[in-house]
């Protein structure tokens, strides 16, 4: 296991636990609250975080508007039930069984229902748009080295493939990020973009996943970059099925 | 050598407790999991919760939430289990166990026989 | 819940005979990080807590004797003794240890003709 030896630790996921009783005493390491071994040399998938924490082409004027099948996750924090992979489970229920099927990560992408809910398949997220306001500075940043300092952070701190950074988007005071990775373009062993989207997210808001790592400091051309506002947009490869009633809301 | 001691047999009535210990030695105890399984006369083995004393993570058997309380006291290198509202069913024999891909330790087991 | 099925539930065979028992699961207990099977057997006899056999699916247990051995991945496991001895008279076990709830099969009873 890629786990430190000497004080077997999770570099990369800093919700387990570490032990070395793995094959041969060697140290391995169980997310908490699932029990599922984690690779510690990647990142850990959203799903098992999530259980752990409940237990581009530059044109002018290029910001993008959300598809009308953009999801936000509105929902907040919940208990999922992950696959063996821990990847999400197509389908989520609460204490309450009231059932609800999401995508690749874990949004809703159905109206709630009961247990005769039925989701065929897990919907895979393509496409997320994150869509960030920083805070005023002097002035604007300089979008090829913004440009330049998110790609790195994204291919050194979460180890995502730069082929997956789609575009990265400028217009004081917004920044927005696009991933995208079909199913036929992730490859054994790449870093899905949910999980890479979701260390992001946790590492903008102050609450890094990273084991004894300091937290995000971003900056350009060593001007702080500091985040006031995060959205996340996320496409999936089919369209979500929600009612028209909460269309409309 | 790796040993697990646990305490001895108990005959409870039903609508009460029992608490299980098992003292660990020849081994850092806050460094491995320790997990509790039960099985009642002629039956299978049944995984009824584990804890990482180091840290004092713990995790439950959803069958049993509510009704088992694992907990470890590092000064001595002793866990315990707990089961309340004890009924008829419950009559096992419990075992502690070191978890892990290579810890074949388990404890000697204890019997609790749960008659009115 | 993970859920274990082993089959058969009891079989005899004379000493010296080779015998194959199998454990099925309803999820994968191949670990995509590590490539590792989450998946020990145990053997327990009357009287005694059980004793650690295989874990990893295929890796035995240091001082247990090599006529146990261990195969499979994914969902289809099967523990086989090359040549059975009067001192393997026992309830054999699988344990899944991959995600909470661990989880065991209903065990495999070895008796001898």
């Known amino acids: 296991h890629t786990a430190a030896q000497d004080n077997c630790t999770c570099p990369t996921n800093k919700m387990t636990v570490c032990s070395p009783d793995g094959p041969g005493g060697r140290c391995q390491c169980r997310a908490l609250g699932s029990g599922m071994a984690v690779d510690c040399s990647t990142l850990t998938s959203k799903c098992l975080l999530l259980k752990a924490r409940m237990s581009a082409p530059k044109n002018a004027r290029t910001l993008v508007r959300p598809s009308e099948h953009a999801l936000v996750d509105n929902d907040g924090l919940y208990d999922p039930d992950c696959d063996p992979e821990g990847r999400f489970k197509a389908r989520q229920c609460n204490q309450t069984s009231v059932c609800w099927c999401v995508n690749s990560v874990g949004v809703r992408r159905t109206d709630k229902g009961d247990l005769s809910l039925r989701c065929d398949e897990l919907v895979r997220t393509h496409h997320i748009l994150i869509d960030l306001r920083h805070r005023p500075t002097a002035g604007a940043f300089n979008h090829s080295d913004l440009d330049a300092e998110l790609r790195r952070l994204f291919r050194e701190r979460y180890r995502l493939h730069p082929k997956f950074v789609a575009a990265v988007h400028y217009e004081q005071p917004t920044i927005q990020i696009e991933l995208r990775q079909n199913t036929s373009q992730k490859a054994a062993g790449d870093v899905d973009i949910g999980d890479a989207a979701y260390y992001f997210e946790r590492d903008i808001k102050g609450e890094s996943l990273f084991q004894g790592r300091g937290g995000l400091d971003l900056r350009v051309r060593g001007e702080p970059l500091q985040v006031e506002r995060t959205l996340i947009y996320y496409l999936d490869e089919i369209p979500p099925k929600f009612s028209m009633k909460r269309l409309t809301a | 050598q790796v040993q697990l001691v646990q305490s001895g047999a108990e005959v409870k009535k039903p609508g009460a407790s029992v608490k299980v210990s098992c003292k660990a030695s020849?081994?850092?105890?806050?460094?491995?999991?320790l997990g509790w399984v039960r099985q009642a006369p002629g039956q299978g083995l049944e995984w009824m919760g584990n804890?990482?004393?180091?840290?004092?993570?713990?995790n439950y058997n959803e069958k049993f939430k509510g009704r088992v309380t694992i907990t470890a006291d590092t000064s001595t290198s002793t866990a315990y289990m707990e089961l309340s509202s004890l009924r008829s069913e419950d009559t096992a024999v419990y075992y502690c166990?070191?978890?892990?891909?290579?810890?074949?330790?388990w404890g000697q087991g204890t019997l609790v026989t749960v008659s009115s | 819940d993970i859920v274990m099925t082993q089959s058969p539930d009891s079989l005899a065979v004379s000493a010296g005979e080779r015998v194959t028992m199998n454990c099925k699961s309803s999820?994968?207990?191949?670990?995509?990080?590590?490539?590792?099977?989450?998946l020990a057997w145990y053997q327990q006899k009357p009287g005694q807590p059980p004793k650690l056999l295989i874990y990893?699916?295929?890796t035995r247990e240091s001082g247990v004797p090599d006529r146990f051995s261990g195969s499979g991945s994914g969902t289809d496991f099967t523990l086989t003794i090359s040549s059975v001895q009067a001192e393997d008279v026992a309830v054999y076990y699988c344990q899944s240890d991959h995600i909470y709830p661990y989880t065991f099969g209903q065990g495999t009873k070895l008796e001898i003709k």
């Open positions: 166990a070191r978890e892990g891909s290579n810890s074949g330790y």
């Open positions: 999820q994968s207990l191949l670990n995509s990080g590590n490539q590792q099977n989450y």
């Open positions: 804890i990482f004393p180091g840290s004092a993570y713990i």
């Open positions: 990893g699916a295929s």
């Open positions: 020849g081994y850092t105890f806050t460094i491995y999991w």
